[in-house]
Interface confidence: medium
């Protein structure tokens, strides 16, 4: 039940990449508005996105305070223009979200190959340490700052002239691989958190190939 023309939100869904975290829901409001609340299991409810006609709410500022906590959100529905009005039980209609643990569930953003450098038959490939929205002491922390050794990268590399891929792994942001002299190679990387059960891998980075601007080559 509830006040006339007010319906509860449904399909509450967390959308999160590199800790940028948005709660989405349905339906598009007709003569109603929403307010979102977020809490940890043991904490108090904090209200966000007051009386909005949007069907999404950016909760990043709350979840980055402690990315290892488990969060729960709820979306309240109010009649437009009469937000004091409540349902028959004396409170507005609301719907709970699924639980969300940012550290375990945020999607890993698409990585970027920062540079590669060839020295003889070795190539050093460096992955950009992407910035997250986790802020500490006046700076935004990088993915490596937050995940530490839980985060690894997988490098896929192949000769430009063939399609046979090789792989390498690192728990830093750098790879050092052996290549054949005189051959050009292409590279793509993927971020991985092996210990996770969901959202374990990012999408692959854009492909970068030797002989293009990004690399640096020194024959020694």
């Amino acid at each position: 039940s509830g006040t006339t023309n007010t319906v509860a939100a449904y399909n509450l869904t967390w959308k999160s990449t590199n800790f940028k975290t948005i709660l989405e829901w349905e339906p598009k409001p007709v003569n109603q508005v929403y307010t979102v609340q977020i809490s940890t299991k043991s904490g108090d409810w904090k209200s966000k996105c007051f009386y909005t006609t949007d069907t999404e709410c950016d909760l990043t500022d709350e979840i980055v305070k402690d990315v290892k906590q488990t969060y729960l959100a709820r979306v309240f529905s109010y009649p437009a223009g009469n937000v004091e009005s409540t349902g028959s039980a004396g409170e507005p209609l609301y719907e709970n979200s699924p639980e969300f643990t940012p550290y375990l569930e945020t999607n890993l953003g698409q990585p970027t190959i920062q540079s590669f450098e060839q020295v003889g038959t070795k190539v050093n490939v460096t992955v950009e340490d992407e910035r997250t929205l986790v802020r500490r002491n006046n700076t935004f922390l990088s993915l490596r700052d937050v995940f530490g050794k839980d985060l690894i990268y997988t490098l896929y590399y192949w000769k430009s002239s063939s399609s046979g891929k090789k792989t390498a792994k690192t728990n830093t942001n750098e790879f050092l691989i052996d290549v054949d002299k005189g051959e050009n190679y292409c590279f793509s990387v993927q971020a991985v958190i092996p210990s996770r059960t969901v959202n374990r891998k990012s999408t692959d980075s854009p492909v970068e190939c030797m002989g293009q601007e990004k690399g640096e080559f020194r024959e020694i």
Partner: antibody, heavy 121, light 106 residues
Framework: EVQLVESGGGLVQPGGSLRLSCAAS????????MSWVRQAPGKGLEWVGF??????????EYAASVKGRFTISRDNSKNSLYLQMNTLRTEDTAVYYC????????????WGQGTLVTVSS | DIQMTQSPSSLSASVGDRVTITCQAS??????LNWYQHKPGKGPKLLIY???TLQTGVPSRFSGSGSGTDFTFTVSNLQPEDIATYYC????????FGQGTKLEIK
């Protein structure tokens, strides 16, 4: 195995200078924030300052008590952290520790054994 | 800089006791407060971060609470191995340790 080894401590007169070093091994040095923490005789821990990692541009922050007198730097090619201490005061007398800092939860997860700095005339 | 006032500076308790240490910040630090345990000859060890989150592997007899400017650290069922000096550390704006609390067993 992660290791941090400080050196460079000793006796110095008030107004003098000293440079401490911390040799790091067992981890990818450029990926970590590094900090100095000190402990005066019979007193508690005091954070001195830190230098951020490569992703954060190796920027520095200092406690108010040392700002303008102390400078933290790092030589990544040598896996070394430094603390340049100028205009030293008697209250700077302490054991100085270098520590690896995990910023997301402000955890000093590895510590050196410390080096004693005595400022006295 | 933010100042942290920790009390008491020392306390003595018996095995099995419940002990409480408090820390007060000179300004609102949200919940950005940690508790460290420091034993002689060892590096300080993080027990609790973000006021109340237990670090992995830390026994559940350690707990923390608070927000804003007032924080509490509790050891329930005190054990002999808990003899140490305990420090709070704020990390809302730079880093500041409390003065420390030396915990002894009666």
């Amino acid at each position: 195995e992660v290791q941090l080894v400080e050196s460079g401590g000793g006796l110095v007169q008030p107004g003098g200078s000293l440079r401490l070093s911390c040799a790091a091994s067992g981890f990818t040095f450029t990926e970590y924030h590094m900090s100095w923490v000190r402990q005066a005789p019979g007193k508690g821990l005091e954070w001195v300052g830190f230098i951020r990692n490569r992703a954060q541009g190796y920027t520095t922050e200092y406690a108010a008590s040392v700002k303008g007198r102390f400078t933290i730097s790092r030589d990544n090619s040598k896996n070394s952290l430094y603390l340049q201490m100028n205009t030293l005061r008697t209250e700077d007398t302490a054991v100085y520790y270098c520590a690896r800092l995990t910023m997301v939860v402000a955890e000093f997860d590895y510590w050196g054994q410390g080096t004693l700095v005595t400022v006295s005339s | 800089d933010i100042q942290m006032t920790q009390s008491p500076s020392s306390l003595s308790a018996s095995v099995g006791d419940r002990v409480t240490i408090t820390c007060q910040a000179s300004q609102d630090i949200n919940k950005y407060l940690n508790w460290y345990q420091h034993k002689p000859g060892k590096g300080p060890k993080l027990l609790i971060y973000y006021t109340s989150t237990l670090q992995t592997g830390v026994p559940s007899r350690f707990s923390g609470s608070g927000s804003g400017t007032d924080f509490t650290f509790t050891v329930s069922n005190l054990q002999p191995e808990d003899i140490a000096t305990y420090y709070c550390l704020q990390y809302d704006n730079l880093l500041t340790f409390g003065q420390g609390t030396k915990l002894e067993i009666k």
